[in-house]
Interface confidence: low
């Protein structure tokens, strides 16, 4: 393990077109960049807390787990990992918290063998559409990622551009079909208001799930039924009043779900029969004994599996007195 | 049915080195992160290390960074910690554990029957 | 870091008591609590996740509840086969803390 303390040698961030350029010399099998710590037995690079503003030209060839965690990247271009010979056995890739707030298309690119990514703790006002599929081609080559870490890359309020947050991730996920082959995905802690209806249907492999802390109010217009392979929902710390009976088939079909509904706030009225009556028969749910009404206010912290039918009216809209027949 | 099967463990002189394998079974071995716990004889629980699925991401106690690395093999379904530098505050019984859940919940549902390692000259 | 304490560090109690035990977070970590408990010679044990989710196969004498820093766990009835230490362990942080236990005697 080698950990070199030069100052950092990069091509001037004046330049950054020069990020996408492939770099030309193959490093020296022992080399190790600047500010960066490698190990070639167990092929991994750390570039942590290093203030890095470009991802090092100079990776090794054998580098398999990459680190460049808590830099300042700020944009990450074209091509950023594109090398000669080509980064091929590099297959978990970890940007968390490292201040990026653009990735542009094909950024990931020649990365055969790329099967973790982990861009969480970024915030991600510009993440483009061809970020995971390189490329604008209604069908893209399938990507090699299993695993698609973005918790918490919402950037604040005044950084997002005048466009949906959730629009533009779901657009990165969906292009070209190229990320198919993801078993894991997870999006907590992202304000998501609402997950647009496509997102599921198009990502068939899903076996982990995390929408956790966000602010989803409901799940009505988004289908389940494809994802045959779901073991785990996250869907704790959100704003969810009720799940309705089409939404409750579908994560009954399921075989081998698991789902976690905890932290939400249930509003037991009417509407809430059905999802009642499912959560008593249902075993996907986990802790569901400890969900609990929110609203109405009379129903608040009533054990959503202690209530009956008759616990769950709807106030007329009117009072009795001003309604007419 | 879930098993972790912990070998290893056994006695080394200080500033020596050891390696932890945790075995696993019965599960998707590379949808689930994974982490080494450890309790000093007659003392509480310690986190360690917790390594994500694909083992891209890696996370340390202050106390053995820079000393011990945590690492796996989704081929063989075997976790590994590798203990450097070893200190007499090291001995423990080490303990691996599958995690469940997502980013903010996370908690460990299997853990295996432990390994002792045992720092003295 | 966050730190987490648990209080009392050891408890004397008889079968059917109610019993609880606390845990505070040195930062709000929202309901990212976990409870295991555990026997001498033993691994630890899985009982509550997510502040107040029962584990399965966990009996429903054991509860969780609180969230931000502040964290409780309950046995209703005391039964002979739960004496034992109970240790909680925050994973809202990267690095998952454990507090120092809770040891459960019979009085």
């Known amino acids: 393990s080698s950990s070199p303390t030069s100052s950092a040698s990069s091509f001037s961030s004046s330049a950054p077109f020069l990020a996408s350029a492939v770099s030309a010399q193959p490093p020296l099998p022992d080399q190790c960049p600047a500010l960066c710590e490698c190990s070639e037995a167990a092929r991994t690079v750390k570039c942590v807390n290093r203030n890095l503003t470009e991802v090092p030209t100079d990776l090794p060839a054998y580098v398999r787990n990459l680190f460049l965690t808590g830099n300042q990247l700020a944009v990450l271009p074209a091509g950023a990992f594109a090398r000669r010979p080509p980064l091929a056995e590099l297959a978990a890739l970890n940007l968390s918290g490292s201040r990026l707030d653009e990735v542009r298309a094909g950024a990931f690119e020649h990365l055969p063998s790329l099967r973790q990514l982990d861009l969480s703790h970024n915030p991600l006002a510009d993440l483009s559409p061809f970020a995971f599929s390189g490329s604008n081609a209604s069908v893209s080559a399938p990507s090699p990622l299993v695993e698609l870490i973005l918790n918490h890359i919402v950037p604040p309020e005044d950084e997002r551009q005048n466009r949906s947050f959730e629009g533009m991730v779901v657009a990165a996920l969906l292009a070209g079909r190229a990320l198919q082959g993801l078993r894991r995905l997870e999006l907590a802690s992202n304000h998501f208001l609402y997950l647009p209806r496509d997102v599921l249907a198009q990502l068939p492999s899903l076996r982990h799930l995390d929408l956790s802390n966000n602010s989803l109010v409901s799940l009505t217009y988004v289908s389940f039924r494809n994802l045959t392979h779901l073991e785990s929902l996250h869907l704790e710390d959100n704003a969810l009043k009720v799940l309705h009976n089409g939404t409750l088939a579908e994560l009954q079909g399921l075989p081998h779900i698991r789902v976690f509904l905890d932290n939400n706030p249930w509003v037991c009225d009417c509407h809430m029969a059905d999802m009642v009556t499912w959560l008593k028969e249902t075993e996907v749910v986990q802790g569901k004994d400890r969900l609990t009404c929110a609203y109405p206010e009379k129903m608040r912290n009533r054990v959503l599996l202690e209530l009956n039918s008759a616990d769950l009216d709807c106030d007329p809209i009117l009072p009795p007195s001003l309604q007419t027949s | 049915e879930v098993q972790l099967l912990e070998s290893g463990g056994g006695l080394v002189q200080p500033g020596g080195s050891l390696r932890l394998s945790c075995a696993a079974s019965?599960?998707?071995?590379?949808?689930?992160?994974m982490s080494w716990v450890r309790q000093a004889p007659g003392k509480c629980l310690e986190w360690v290390s917790a390594?994500?699925?694909?083992?891209?991401?890696?996370y340390y106690a202050d106390s053995v960074k820079g000393r011990f690395t945590i690492s796996r093999d989704n081929s063989k379904n075997t976790l590994y910690l590798q203990m450097n530098s070893l200190r007499a505050e090291d001995t423990a019984v080490y303990y691996c554990?599958?995690?469940?859940?997502?980013?903010?919940?996370?908690?460990?549902?299997?853990w295996g029957q432990g390994t002792l390692v045992t720092v003295s000259s | 870091d966050i730190q987490m304490t648990q209080s009392p560090s050891s408890l004397s109690a008889s079968v059917g008591d109610r019993v609880t035990i606390t845990c505070r977070a040195s930062q709000s970590i929202r309901s990212a609590l976990n409870w295991y408990q555990q026997k001498p010679g033993k691994a630890p044990k899985l009982l509550i996740y997510a502040a107040s989710s029962l584990q399965s196969g966990v009996p429903s004498r054991f509860s969780g509840s609180g969230s931000g820093t502040d964290f409780t766990l309950t046995i209703s009835s005391l039964q002979p086969e739960d004496f034992a230490t109970y240790y909680c362990?925050?994973?809202?942080?990267?690095?998952?803390?454990f507090g120092c236990g809770t040891k459960l005697e019979i009085k």
């Open positions: 362990q925050q994973t809202y942080g990267y690095l998952h803390t």
């Open positions: 554990a599958r995690y469940y859940g997502g980013y903010y919940s996370a908690w460990m549902d299997y």
């Open positions: 390594i994500s699925g694909s083992g891209g991401s890696t």
């Open positions: 019965g599960f998707d071995f590379e949808s689930y992160a």
